[in-house]
């Protein structure tokens, strides 16, 4: 018979013959022959291969370096890589999450619109009229000004985006 020029899915052509690829989690030890199947071996601990392959070496799992603020989010298996994320209060600097930076704080006059996650930074927004923030924080939203009326008081000092209103007693009309 004619030697094949192409092979089926999950096979590869070598020495004019179709051999089975190794399944994910295994590496190639020896190609098949006319008389033997492809020989594959499982990846060792801390190694993986995530595709049908003919690799002779497995990939090393990613190392989540604590010196870069990283920790393991999902432990790798023989078929998957380790996924790193950042320690509490930090977020990844890139999609690949190779290092971390501290979450930004929102300055006075700004409040937190969206609290940071392991992969995204804090999103701040300016405090609108009627709201204020007098602290630098990665968690605090803008607070509404105190309502003097509900306390039967009057505004003695107007509020700003950084300060609350100051309430005081109503002036008594003298007789």
């Amino acid at each position: 018979p004619e030697p094949p020029t192409a092979c089926r899915e999950k096979q590869y052509l070598i020495n004019s013959q179709c051999c089975s690829l190794c399944q994910p989690g295994q590496k190639l030890v020896s190609d098949c022959t006319e008389f033997t199947e492809t020989e594959c071996l499982p990846c060792g601990e801390s190694e993986f291969l995530d595709t049908w392959n003919r690799e002779t070496h497995c990939h090393q799992h990613k190392y989540c370096d604590p010196n870069l603020g990283l920790r393991v989010q999902q432990k790798g298996t023989s078929e998957t890589d380790t996924i790193c994320t950042c320690e509490e209060g930090w977020h990844c600097t890139s999609e690949a999450c190779e290092s971390c930076v501290l979450h930004r704080s929102c300055s006075p006059g700004f409040g937190v619109k969206q609290i940071a996650t392991g992969v995204s930074d804090t999103i701040c927004e300016p405090c609108p009229v009627g709201f204020f923030s007098n602290v630098s924080s990665a968690f605090e939203k803008c607070h509404p000004w105190t309502s003097c009326e509900t306390k039967d008081l009057v505004v003695q000092q107007a509020g700003t985006n950084k300060t609350d209103v100051v309430c005081g007693p109503q002036d008594r009309l003298r007789a």
Epitope: E9, K10, D50, H59, Q74, I83, S94, A96, V119
Partner: nanobody, 126 residues
Framework: QVQLQESGGGLVQAGGSLRLSCAAS????????MGWFRQAPGKEREFVAA????????KYADSVKGRFTISTDNAKNTVYLQMDSLKPEDTAVYRC???????????????????WGQGTQVTVSS
């Protein structure tokens, strides 16, 4: 859950170019490989190109090698397929696919991808 939205398809003359885009939303995919597949009328879906996240390794089907280029923009969560020197036999619906988190290698088999877009039509006229 990941949503994938392809764009950039259309009608083009043989020898022309198109650039397909696939925007991912719902989850960052920076640690996952991405690929493009295509399906012509009455044919099986076939692998076109893939890109991994370890050093941006790429794989191409023999039929598109030297004509198509796959790339990503992680900041925009987008994968691109630049298609040059198009031929009538490139006519198909092109779908992008993403592997799950922890699968960084470019893969050529459909069952190694976890999320799929709806597809965009590419028609090459002679």
């Amino acid at each position: 859950q990941v949503q994938l939205q392809e764009s950039g398809g259309g009608l083009v003359q043989a020898g022309g170019s198109l650039r397909l885009s696939c925007a991912a939303s719902g989850r960052t995919f920076g640690r996952s490989a991405m690929g493009w597949f295509r399906q012509a009328p009455g044919k099986e879906r076939e692998f076109v190109a893939a890109i991994g996240t370890r050093g941006g390794s790429t794989k191409y089907a023999d039929s598109v090698k030297g004509r198509f280029t796959i790339s990503t923009d992680n900041a925009k969560n987008t994968v691109y397929l630049q298609m040059d020197s198009l031929k009538p036999e490139d006519t198909a619906v092109y779908r992008c696919a993403v592997r799950g988190p922890g699968y960084p290698s470019a893969a050529i088999f459909q069952d190694e991808y976890h999320y799929w877009g709806q597809g965009t039509q590419v028609t090459v006229s002679s």
